[in-house]
């Protein structure tokens, strides 16, 4: 008799893939657009990228530092109108993008929760919350939420409105923290909240701690759905240097989570190459003419346009990693056990009941190495074949589709490799 | 400053085991990997092995691999180098070699020990 | 494994004039990804552990004289002493750094003539 198929898990839509964060409209857009309308232009775009949703803003009416003059029901006239909103929405649900929208209220202040007036503008977001579920949002992002004097219980009554309209609605909350014990008390006072956070950030340039924070932060939240990324907002070269970036991709893809990029992410791109322009923001490149101020400073390998015609680019890697994350069950809600590998390799089995399982060996390390993958550390539900195929290298030049031998697999400096295996009973 | 500094000279019989210990100060010690070279007398340098101190992680050099453990403890910033099964050919100066995380080559070492096999 | 090749065995030079030292490996050391070649060059006094002097072919450890400098890319390196000083007297180390098990060339030793 067959074995019994396990139950599947229930699934919600940013359970399915990645987010994609636009928090600048302007620098998304470029050419000194910047507006709703624009925006919607680029959903194809979006599309391209296979994320699940899109977390935009905030776009709403924000005079810096004054309470009285930031209205979370307005949608500030620079960005567009409430009908390019609708009409935003309505093409995105088309797509299958869902989007989330940033309430940050004071993002263009100091203070982004106004602290002298904390009850005034839990009072705002509130009514917000239930002005833009109506309207047909399909969830919220606030940030910086570690200058929200009793967070905890706001983001609970936060949880319970959107949750209230709908069991399918999101709330995103962001903090700069990336102190685990912070991150897991406001985690356990909010059951489906979303926590992006500067967690992993603390990896160091060299990746030398992405292992042990990545484990601790698994085995501290137990069963818990969380998400990945390096910081609630900014884009990962601020981070990670250009070596790292292929690598952190591939793990961000293939993590139990929710990844969670800004735009601009799948490209590398990186303010300190583009003189002038802001850490936070800086325009996206689409083409080479899209950052016009220093002729010839952008090159179309920088650009989403010369990424797009290169198989090997660090967009394609990316379009791939979506596609893949978003159709195997193994990667949608598989289990995850990591195991010894060497030193600077990181690897991990990704598997769910009879279907296709996935290995992952990351090498954060500057030189090429044989992966002495321990198997003994596996529990028998996810023991290793002898050999299994090469889904994808983060690097040129090998071979995919090929069958590796694991007892001899090597890894070039920063290389990392996706690995797919059957199901043996 | 950064120092290794390592067990003195050792003597042993063929067959025995020998454990060659580094101890590193002036830097965090788990923020560094530590590598193991020997040296025969007026010979060149041999590669064998490497640890991550920060959790224990190995790699071996084919040649020794079955022979050779390294190990550490954090508590007192020290790396460990223990050749099993030794012959009269491992009679050599055996050195440990920091590198920075993810490195291959080496930016302190220790003065050696020189560890003789004879019957 | 990387086979390292280093000549000449040793080498006479007078105080002041340029020593050169070659080291050939057989295959290429150049990371594609970051442009680097991963050659890093030791010098090693009687009774002492060896000293690094550069790491990636080029770049010279700190506290290393100007005076040495290393060349190279691919699967050819040149170690370059300028202007040979007395206490440069010793024997040179390559290496490679590109991919485990690190391999040493055979060392080239550097005399006064």
């Known amino acids: 008799r067959a074995p019994r198929c396990r139950e599947l898990p229930a699934q919600k839509w940013w359970h399915t893939g990645a987010l994609y964060r636009i928090g600048d409209l302007q620098a998304f857009q470029g050419h000194g657009a910047g507006n709703l309308a624009g925006l919607k232009g680029r959903l194809d775009y979006l599309s391209s990228l296979k994320v699940k949703g899109l977390v935009l803003g905030p776009i709403h009416k924000n005079q810096k530092d004054d309470v009285a003059q930031t209205d979370l029901l307005q949608i500030d006239p620079n960005f567009g109108s409430k009908e390019d909103f609708d009409s935003l929405l309505q093409s995105a649900k088309k797509k299958s993008i869902r989007v989330i929208l940033d309430l940050t209220p004071n993002y263009r202040g100091e203070n982004s929760w106004f602290s002298t007036q904390v009850d005034t503008v839990a009072t705002k977001v509130k009514d917000a919350l239930e002005f833009w579920l109506q309207a047909g949002v399909d969830g919220f992002q606030v940030r910086d939420i570690e200058n929200l004097k009793d967070a905890s219980s706001f983001l609970a009554e936060w949880q319970n409105i959107t949750k209230g309209f709908s069991e399918d609605r999101l709330l995103i909350a962001g903090t700069n923290s990336s102190d685990l014990q912070q991150i897991l008390s406001l985690l356990e006072s909010n059951k489906d909240l979303l926590l992006t956070s500067s967690y992993l950030s603390d990896s160091g340039s060299t990746g030398e701690h992405t292992k042990s924070l990545v484990t601790q932060y698994l085995n501290a939240t137990g069963n818990r759905w969380c998400s990945w990324s390096l910081s609630q907002a900014r884009l990962l070269t601020s981070f990670l240097p250009a070596q790292l970036l292929r690598l952190y991709q591939l793990m961000l893809f293939t993590l139990p989570g929710t990844p969670v990029f800004s735009y601009g992410d799948e490209i590398g791109l990186d303010a300190a190459a583009l003189p002038g322009q802001p850490m936070e923001a800086p325009v996206m490149l689409w083409d080479e003419s899209s950052f016009p101020d220093i002729p010839g400073a952008v090159s179309a390998n920088m650009t989403v346009k010369g990424q797009s015609e290169d198989p090997g680019s660090l967009l394609s890697l990316f379009r791939r990693l979506s596609d893949q994350r978003s159709k195997e069950r193994s990667l949608l809600h598989g289990d995850f056990h990591a195991f010894s590998a060497g030193p600077g390799l990181f690897s991990y089995i990704r598997h769910w009941d009879q279907n296709e399982r996935f290995l992952v060996v990351l090498n954060f390390g500057d030189v090429g190495l044989s992966a002495g993958l321990q198997a003994s550390d596996l529990p028998a539900s996810a023991s290793l074949p002898a050999k299994a195929d090469l889904l994808l290298s983060t690097q040129p030049g090998r071979e995919e589709g090929s069958p590796l031998e694991l007892e001899r697999l090597k890894l070039e400096p920063h290389e990392g490799l996706l690995l797919r295996f059957p199901y043996a009973a | 400053q950064v120092q290794l500094v390592q067990s003195g000279a050792e003597v042993k019989k063929p067959g025995a085991s020998v454990k060659v210990s580094c101890k590193a100060s002036g830097y965090t010690f788990t923020s560094y990997w530590m590598h193991w070279v020997r040296q025969a007398p007026g010979q060149g340098l041999e590669w064998m092995g490497i640890i991550d101190p920060s959790d224990s992680e190995t790699n071996y050099a084919q040649k020794f691999q079955g022979r050779v453990t390294s190990t550490v403890d954090k508590s007192i910033s020290t790396a460990y180098m223990e050749l099993s099964r030794l012959r009269s050919d491992d009679t050599v100066v055996y050195y440990c070699a920091r590198a920075s995380y993810g490195k291959g080559y080496f930016d302190y070492w220790g003065q050696g020990t020189l560890v003789t096999v004879s019957s | 494994d990387i086979v390292m090749t280093q000549s000449p065995d040793s080498l006479a030079v007078s105080l002041g004039e340029r020593a050169t030292i070659n080291c050939k490996s057989s295959?290429?050391?150049?990371?594609?990804?970051?442009?680097?070649?991963?050659l890093a060059w030791y010098q090693q006094k009687p009774g002492q552990p060896p000293k690094l002097l550069i790491y990636f072919a080029s770049t010279r450890e700190s506290g290393v004289p100007d005076r040495f400098s290393g060349s190279g890319s691919g699967t050819d390196f040149t170690l370059t002493i300028s202007s040979l000083q007395a206490e440069d007297v010793a024997v040179y180390y390559c290496?490679?750094?590109?991919?485990?098990?690190?391999?040493f060339g055979g060392g080239t030793k550097v005399e006064i003539k």
């Open positions: 295959q290429s050391l150049l990371n594609n990804i970051n442009q680097k070649n991963y």
């Open positions: 290496q490679q750094h590109y991919s485990s098990p690190f391999t």
